[in-house]
């Protein structure tokens, strides 16, 4: 920061609540889409430009005037892999976190005209180009259709789709949210010959029902009904199919071939959790038992003579956990070599750190190619010579991210490609590789302002800066910005990391109020090196509040000893560790221990509530937004991963003694603000309604706010501004700030 160390002498403005809510200072992105191994698309002033990666020269791929007469606001576009057509998306209607419906039109780039015949229907649920050429697969009314040519009729692949009952090629609520993190349940083979898809059956899944109040003129509220399996309830079932899209018939119905789950899965409830094509005629499927400590990978080959898919038992790979669950959230995806005979996968090693292991499809055991007291975050690219991955190895900082490459002919030859590029400014990288990994874009997101650069894999040479946020840098020179401290404390001989957003001109000899910003869910990370402009920036800059976050037991990317500590025990150690962190912070000398608050959203709202209900005496007040209050209210896939089943034989006791409601009496000692959206499809309003009831029943005075028709994000423009303004007032009142 410019100016003096003396806050009173610094005449620059602070970062205000309005700055946050109105997004006054915007971080510039550089969102590119690779279309080949040397070209990418980039949108500039609504023109779509095509750039040559090597030389940086560009030409207009599509002028912004092309669709002036279109008559619809285009939400998104997607170019066919052969560059002949562009799919235009409009009439976007959000459903859940990832899912939406939309209308689509196809523009012929050769003829420079919209295709008017055989259009994709309105309210389509998902559309995807084949990986090569210009086939299209789409889902409409829960059934799958394939277009071989954009101007020709679709081939109907499935006929069983039924709203809220049978889902073909799309996920139901719980698979979307907790398994695939996507609406799509379609997977094209690499050359577009085969289309694999999942079918979900929610016939027996109980419905969550909630009111949607809509416009003031609606006399009777609408009731939204969603098949949503809560912990211990009946789950969706899944089937998996493959269809050959090179042999669809103009007259007869398509034939889909089913691949059944392994026998070890069929003995009980199970999930399909990963689908990866290995080659044109080899597919890998990962299945997971409902008790999520046991998974199986099947590798299946196409038999041309029978038209069937054969999954040899000898090629099955079992992954299990004795200390918790498989994977960070689910089993990791395999990255196959070109011949499909081997693959690389992130799994837990014997020390409980997640590293890359090399598998051969016909062998049970694998060879770890990375090791250490750090973790591989993701495999980003695989070529014939190198594997590229992101890890948090550098300087032993779990909250950092860097890009590495490892030589496949000699695993000892590892190079960090990003560590020394800009070590002060850039410690948290993500990457986007071109189609065959000849080039890559590095996206640095902190601790300095975001920086986007382009690189060549041939010599790992930096080619050019794509965006350096210099305009924002210049603007922020005139703002009293907070600083960010990332450090660790040692508890029971274990390092636990925290971050603090410190007010401008922070003076460790002074006493500051502290707000603990908590999430603390399994495999979470809140202490990192990312630059953010958020509510905390305002609180620190304008209100001189320290905003701290702490990654305690249960947090991720530091080994299973820490992450699996809360296995079967949600609401215990991760809650206690937030309290202990606050105690440690108050011992640092610059925290006013009479003005410590806590807040969190979702899992963070649960932890906030459990902390405030603990009777620790550490916290004066807190805010819980959309909190879980009892694990039997939350979805089966997420909850049971960590808690097992709510049955007497399994873990019912802990389900029952980890509720917020059971701590109601202790809320008399704190000031509590409880907030929830009435149309939250994820953490149901029910959860806050039960907290409220329990507090009322024991005579606790507390504050509450509901947001009508808002979902888990409370993200509509007006609600977003309202909630943060409301929370700001609450925190300022709690801290006796003017």
């Amino acid at each position: 920061n410019k100016g003096t160390d003396d806050a009173t002498a610094d005449s620059r403005k602070t970062y205000t609540l309005t700055d946050y809510l109105k997004n006054t200072y915007r971080l510039k992105l550089y969102s590119l889409r690779w279309i080949s191994d040397h070209e990418y698309l980039y949108k500039q002033e609504n023109n779509i430009l095509v750039f040559n990666a090597e030389y940086g020269n560009s030409s207009v791929f599509l002028e912004n005037s092309t669709f002036d007469e279109f008559g619809h606001s285009i939400n998104d576009y997607s170019i066919s892999p052969d560059g002949q057509f562009i799919l235009l998306e409009y009439n976007y209607v959000k459903q859940w976190r990832h899912s939406y419906t939309a209308s689509y039109d196809i523009y012929d780039l050769n003829k420079r005209q919209l295709i008017t015949e055989e259009r994709i229907p309105n309210n389509t649920q998902w559309v995807t180009w084949s990986p090569v050429g210009h086939k299209l697969a789409y889902v409409w009314n829960n059934d799958i259709y394939v277009k071989i040519e954009p101007n020709l009729p679709s081939y109907r692949i499935t006929w069983t789709g039924k709203e809220d009952i049978i889902y073909n090629g799309i996920t139901d609520w719980v698979y979307e949210e907790e398994v695939f993190s996507a609406y799509s349940a379609l997977w094209w083979s690499p050359n577009g010959t085969f289309l694999a898809y999942a079918q979900f059956n929610d016939t027996e899944v109980p419905l969550i029902e909630y009111s949607f109040y809509s416009d003031e003129s609606l006399q009777y509220p609408k009731t939204v009904r969603v098949p949503y399996p809560k912990a211990g309830a009946v789950n969706p079932t899944v089937k998996f199919f493959v269809v050959n899209t090179d042999s669809l018939s103009s007259v007869t119905n398509a034939t889909s071939i089913q691949i059944t789950a392994p026998a070890s899965m069929l003995i009980g409830d199970h999930y399909l959790c990963d689908v990866t094509w290995a080659t044109q005629e080899r597919i890998s499927l990962q299945w997971l038992r409902r008790i999520q400590n046991y998974s199986v990978m099947d590798i299946c080959d196409y038999d041309e003579s029978s038209g069937r898919w054969n999954c040899l038992v000898a090629r099955q790979h079992i992954e299990m956990s004795t200390t918790g669950w498989v994977g960070r959230f689910r089993p990791s995806e395999p990255h196959f070599t070109l011949d499909g005979n081997s693959f690389y996968k992130i799994i837990s090693n014997e020390e409980g750190y997640r590293h890359i292991c090399y598998f051969q499809i016909d062998k049970k055991d694998c060879t770890f190619i990375t090791k250490g007291t750090w973790e591989v975050i993701g495999i980003e690219a695989l070529t014939s010579d190198y594997l590229y991955y992101i890890s948090n190895e550098y300087k032993g900082m779990p909250g950092g991210r860097n890009l590495y490459k490892i030589q496949l002919s000699d695993y000892t030859k590892v190079t960090c490609l990003s560590c020394e590029l800009n070590p002060e400014r850039c410690q948290y990288y993500s990457v986007s590789f071109s189609k065959e990994a000849k080039y890559y874009q590095l996206r640095c997101s902190g601790p300095g302002l975001p920086l986007y650069t382009l690189h060549s894999s041939v010599n790992d040479k930096g080619l050019r800066v794509l965006e350096d946020n210099s305009a924002l840098d210049k603007m922020l020179q005139n703002v009293q910005m907070p600083s960010k401290k990332l450090d660790f404390i040692i508890l029971n001989e274990t390092k636990f990391w925290y971050q603090m957003i410190l007010p401008p001109h922070f003076d460790k000899s002074k006493k500051y109020p502290l707000l603990l910003d908590v999430y603390a869910g399994p495999c979470s990370q809140k202490a990192d090196t990312v630059f953010r402009l958020n509510w905390a920036t305002y609180l620190a800059s304008t209100e001189n509040i320290i905003v701290a976050s702490f990654d305690g037991r249960g947090s991720g990317y530091q080994g299973d000893k820490i992450m699996h500590a809360i296995n079967r025990r949600l609401g215990t150690f991760e809650v206690e560790d937030q309290i202990e962190a606050a105690r440690q912070f108050s011992k640092m000398g610059f925290v006013d221990n009479k003005r410590i608050a806590i807040w969190g959203w979702s899992y963070g709202g649960y932890v906030t509530s459990m902390v405030l209900g603990s009777g620790s005496g550490v916290f004066k007040c807190g805010i819980a937004v959309a909190p879980v209050s009892r694990w039997e209210y939350y979805d089966s896939v997420y909850t049971e991963r960590y808690m097992g089943l709510p049955t007497p034989e399994d873990n019912l006791d802990h389900y029952r003694n980890s509720t917020v409601m059971s701590r109601a009496e202790n809320f008399k000692q704190v000031e509590y603000l409880l907030i929830h959206g009435t149309a939250d499809d994820n953490v149901h309003f029910q959860q806050s309604a039960q907290i409220s009831k329990a507090l009322v029943d024991v005579g606790v005075d507390f504050q509450a706010m509901w947001y009508t028709d808002e979902d888990h994000g409370i993200a509509s423009s007006t609600a977003h501004q309202h909630i943060y303004t409301h929370m700001s007032h609450f925190i300022k009142q709690c801290f006796s700030l003017p």
Epitope: E117, E149, N151, L152, S250
Partner: antibody, heavy 116, light 110 residues
């Protein structure tokens, strides 16, 4: 068994409208495309247009200004109307089930003569 | 419009092979699909689908009928020809609208 039967007047005066009905039995007309095709006396065959499952229509550009294809799902029927006919419209008119632009089931045909 | 050209008449002896050709003015194929179909029409009857997608036999069609070809050149083969096969044979493309038919090939017995 899927069956399509065309019906309508066999004689139409020039400049008037030709109207034909196709009655479908054996399946619901909302499940497929349905097309009208005509065959001229010299054996030339011409696709007139179709009505899709969704109810939207597509016509042969050569007839677009004069043709209309509609349906009545409650009666499982669909209809052809051709306006301002001339002797050039004399033909046998067929309705057909029309999957992927392939006519897999045809009606027996209705012979229409345009003459004063 | 895509124009389909057929020769008007083909005369063959019973029991022999009949090869009826259809040429399109532009390709009606993609890398994996051939959008060409064949119909048989006997005098006084409606057309009947014989072959779809260039080579697939429609239901209840005898195996002596077969189809082949891709791009612009397609063939309907009847082997061996029987007396019952006397009819006019039409090709039809479905690669793009408007759908178009060939002018028909009349099969005659020598």
């Amino acid at each position: 068994e899927v069956k399509l039967v065309e019906s309508g007047p066999g004689l139409v005066k020039p400049s008037q409208s030709l109207s034909l009905t196709c009655s479908v039995t054996g399946y619901f007309i909302t499940g497929n495309y349905l097309a009208w095709i005509r065959k001229f006396p010299g054996n030339k065959m011409e696709w007139i247009g179709h009505i899709k499952s969704s109810g939207t229509t597509t016509y042969n550009p050569s007839l677009k200004s004069r043709v209309s294809i509609t349906r009545d799902t409650s009666k499982n029927q669909f209809f052809l109307q051709l306006n301002s006919v001339t002797s050039e419209d004399t033909a046998t008119y067929y309705c057909a089930r029309h999957g992927h632009y392939v006519m897999d089931v045809w009606g027996q045909g209705a012979s229409v003569t345009v003459s004063s | 419009d895509i124009v389909l050209t057929q020769s008007p008449v083909l005369a063959v002896s019973l029991g022999q092979r009949a090869t009826i050709s259809c040429r399109a003015s532009q390709s009606v194929s993609t890398s994996t699909y051939n959008f060409m179909h064949w119909y048989q029409q006997k005098p006084g009857q409606q057309p009947r689908l014989l072959i779809y997608d260039a080579s697939h036999l429609a239901s209840s069609v005898p195996a002596r009928f077969s189809g082949s070809g891709s791009g612009t050149d397609f063939t309907l083969t009847i082997n061996p020809v029987q007396a019952d096969d006397i009819a006019t044979y039409y090709c039809q493309q479905s690669r793009e609208l408007p759908l178009t038919f060939g002018s028909g090939t009349k099969l005659e017995i020598k």
